[in-house]
């Protein structure tokens, strides 16, 4: 750490006195102090001498000696008072700028330490401080206004009592700036705009900030627009609004519009797209397949996306059959708006019943006309099976009918003993029928197929089973020959009640 001679923290001299301050360090040293006249500086290796032979009140201040090469950054300081009976204050700056809630140092240095007891801070023209102003005083540094407020942006003077009268410093202007958290907040409305050629349109770009010093502009495809600005102040924020009014839009008005605002903290921008069309439009689409298959008893939501301008004048869901003339309940229809020109319409079909299969159509209307989008809903059913014994062309035949959706396939099993269902251990023979005869196959209905098994002689201690299955499930029917005729068993679990 460098050493200053004289080795005292404070030195008090009279105007006109000679002052010599010597600093010695291990390496080269440097002086730092208030900007003031009449000092001469002499450096010699590891020492530096600051001297004046005519000290004035303006030399009052703290002089610090540092050793630039010292990694610890050590320094030594001495405070010099030049006590001028006519000049109790040495003001180092006449303007101080701080942000709100910071401490503001008004750098009026007392030239005579004896005067400290009688100092005070006042405002120019003898006006007292506002009672809200809290300050402290240091003879070395001046007055510090603590946690300065914007309202304390005033002109101040430092006052000292000398021989019973108050002597003022020159004035110091304090500027307390509002803390600006960032670039101005922006809104650009609408977020998207569509108009038919010849219609009117309005685009509003507005910016707000706690400070009045900011700029805002609206640009179209990178061209700045000349629009008169409206200014306002509310909710403790300054607002600047640019309104673009277009009486009759044309295709050249279409494109990208950007609202841009900037202040000392930076820039914010937001954009929107303006589309100009020749005529009204109405487009319906769905992310879903228009052909839907759902298992009976389950639920389904049908969703339609609508893009339209102008807005919809009407819309509804309609059931087009074929089973009944019922219509979807309005409470199951739901509409959500994604944005101004895009909407989603949903029809909820919970716990579907057989009579609810068929065609569902969403219809919408706007000045561009009517549009419709139709869904085809087919219900899936597990197979239902029945077996009868009959004679065809004189031959004994087991006839198995299976109905379900999708189309069931059929397998015959012959097993030993009398049973409701053949298990693997009992199976004697298996026949697959790859091409059962389709008895009925209408849209939205179950498919009914028939499979024939010709049996020359019915074995009485055996069971003949017809099994049908599809992607939903399976069903079976066991046929047990008995001497008095044939006996059939449809297993309980395959009795189906939708």
């Amino acid at each position: 750490i460098p050493v200053i001679e004289p080795s005292v923290p404070e030195l008090v001299v009279k105007p006109g006195a000679t002052v010599t301050l010597r600093c010695v360090g291990n390496g080269s040293v440097e002086w730092d102090g208030p900007p003031s006249p009449h000092w001469t500086l002499y450096s010699d290796g590891s020492s530096s001498i600051l001297s004046t032979n005519n000290a004035t009140f303006q030399n009052t201040g703290t002089y610090r000696c540092t050793e630039p090469g010292d990694p610890l950054g050590g320094s030594a300081a001495i405070h010099l008072y030049v006590k001028d009976p006519a000049r109790p204050w040495n003001v180092l700056a006449q303007e101080v700028v701080v942000f709100e809630d910071q401490d503001a140092l008004l750098p009026c240095l007392l030239t005579d330490p004896v005067l400290e007891a009688g100092v005070s801070l006042v405002r120019v023209r003898g006006r007292p401080l506002m009672r809200h102003t809290n300050y402290s005083f240091s003879p070395w540094h001046g007055f510090t206004i603590h946690r300065a407020k914007f309202i304390q942006s005033q002109d101040y003077q430092c006052s000292a009592l000398m021989g019973g009268r108050k002597v003022m410093s020159i004035s110091i202007r304090l500027k307390v700036q509002k803390v600006i958290p960032g670039p101005p907040a922006l809104t650009l409305v609408p977020a998207e705009l569509v108009r038919i050629r010849g219609e009117a349109a309005q685009i509003v770009c507005s910016a707000s900030s706690v400070d009045v010093n900011f700029d805002v502009f609206l640009q179209h495809n990178n061209t700045k627009l000349a629009i008169p600005q409206q200014s306002d102040f509310h909710n403790n924020r300054y607002q600047k609004v640019l309104t673009l009014n277009l009486d009759q839009v044309d295709f050249q008005h279409a494109g990208n519009y950007s609202c841009v605002a900037s202040n000392v903290q930076g820039k914010h921008s937001t954009s929107m797209f303006f589309r100009v069309v020749e005529s009204a439009y109405l487009n319906l689409s769905s992310e879903q397949n228009l052909i839907q298959e759902v298992t009976v008893g389950e639920g389904l939501n049908l969703k339609v996306m609508v893009e339209a301008y102008p807005g919809l004048q009407g819309f509804n869901w309609t059931y087009l059959g074929p089973f009944s003339d019922h219509q979807p309940e309005p409470k199951l229809a739901n509409a959500t708006t994604k944005d101004t020109y895009r909407h989603t319409f949903t029809l909820s079909l919970p716990r579907l019943k057989p009579s609810e299969a068929g065609r569902y159509s969403f219809l919408a209307r706007n000045p561009g006309g009517w549009r419709a989008l139709t869904f085809e809903l087919t219900l899936r059913y597990p197979p239902e099976v029945s077996v009868i014994w009959t004679f065809i062309n004189g031959s004994g035949t087991l006839l198995c009918a299976a109905s379900g959706y999708p189309q069931p396939n059929v397998t015959w099993l012959q097993c030993s003993g009398h049973t409701d269902r053949c298990d693997e251990a009992q199976v004697l023979q298996v026949w697959d029928d790859p091409y059962p005869e389709v008895l009925s196959q209408e849209p939205f209905h179950k498919v009914t197929v028939q499979s024939l098994l010709t049996v020359e002689t019915l074995e009485h201690n055996q069971t003949y089973e017809c099994r049908a299955h599809n992607s939903v499930g399976s069903g079976s029917w066991a046929f047990i020959p008995i001497s008095a005729g044939a006996h059939t068993h449809p297993p309980d679990e395959f009795l189906f009640t939708p």
Epitope: S120, L121, V122, R123, R127, P128, L129, M130, R131, H132, T133, N134, Y135, K149, F150, I151, S153, K178, N236
Partner: antibody, heavy 116, light 112 residues
């Protein structure tokens, strides 16, 4: 010329609220605190509180906390005082007054009468 | 709260007399920032208040020099050297140092 123009007299029912305005002109509104003072008939003066027009920060006399709310609208250079849950005790003349290290200018006063 | 006690409550005077009003605070009203926020106001019938003196002894602009203020700590005085007819009204002292700010009860200056 500094002027503080207050809203007109008010006759209100007990239990209701009232909002008194004070429009400032002839000076920069945001450079001075605004004070509010109550003068009851035949009584002395009571300081209600003050407000910094820049921030809306207020200091209240504890006696009026919950009774009075001070606000400002910088765009119109207007200070407001809302008084709520009014009783006959609130009948008085209310003044707004500018503060510059001292209260130097006063409004003409707003007479509030609370009566059923 | 700081209580401001004014005496007398009524002061009958003749035109040209000297008038003196006293105001005593229940505690020191020297602010931590070293200012003494003591003001004197005059209220004439049917009017609002007018500032006469601020900071104990400073005359507000436009106030005639026959008005003067003095005092320190807790004792303060307003003097009117030669009373004129237009000086009649109620005089209030006021302390602006401690919250809540408080007024004296007032002194009515009236002609004998």
């Amino acid at each position: 010329e500094v002027q503080l123009q207050q809203s007109g007299p008010e006759l209100v029912k007990p239990g209701t609220s009232v909002k008194i305005s004070c429009q400032a002109s002839g000076y920069t509104f945001t450079v001075y605190y605004m004070n509010w003072v109550k003068q009851s008939h035949g009584k002395s003066l009571e300081w209600i509180g003050d407000i910094d027009p820049n921030t809306g920060d207020s200091t209240y006399n504890q006696k009026f906390r919950g009774k009075a709310t001070l606000t400002v609208d910088k765009s119109s250079s207007t200070a407001y005082m809302e008084l709520r849950s009014l009783t006959s005790e609130d009948s008085a003349v209310y003044y707004c007054a500018r503060y510059d290290g001292y209260i130097d200018y006063w409004g003409q006063g707003t007479t509030l009468t609370v009566s059923s | 709260d700081v209580v401001m006690t004014q005496t007398p409550l009524s002061l009958p005077v003749s035109l040209g007399d000297q008038a003196s009003i006293s105001c005593r605070s229940s505690q020191s009203i020297v602010h931590s920032n070293r200012h003494t926020y003591l003001e004197w106001y005059l209220q004439k019938p049917g009017q609002s208040l007018k500032l006469l003196i601020y900071g104990v002894s400073n005359r507000f602009s436009g106030v005639p020099d026959r008005f003067s203020g003095s005092g320190s700590g807790t004792d303060f005085t307003l003097k009117i050297s030669r009373v004129e007819a237009e000086d009649m009204g109620i005089y209030y002292c006021f302390q602006g140092t401690h919250v809540p700010l408080t007024f004296g009860a007032g002194t009515k200056l009236e002609l004998k």
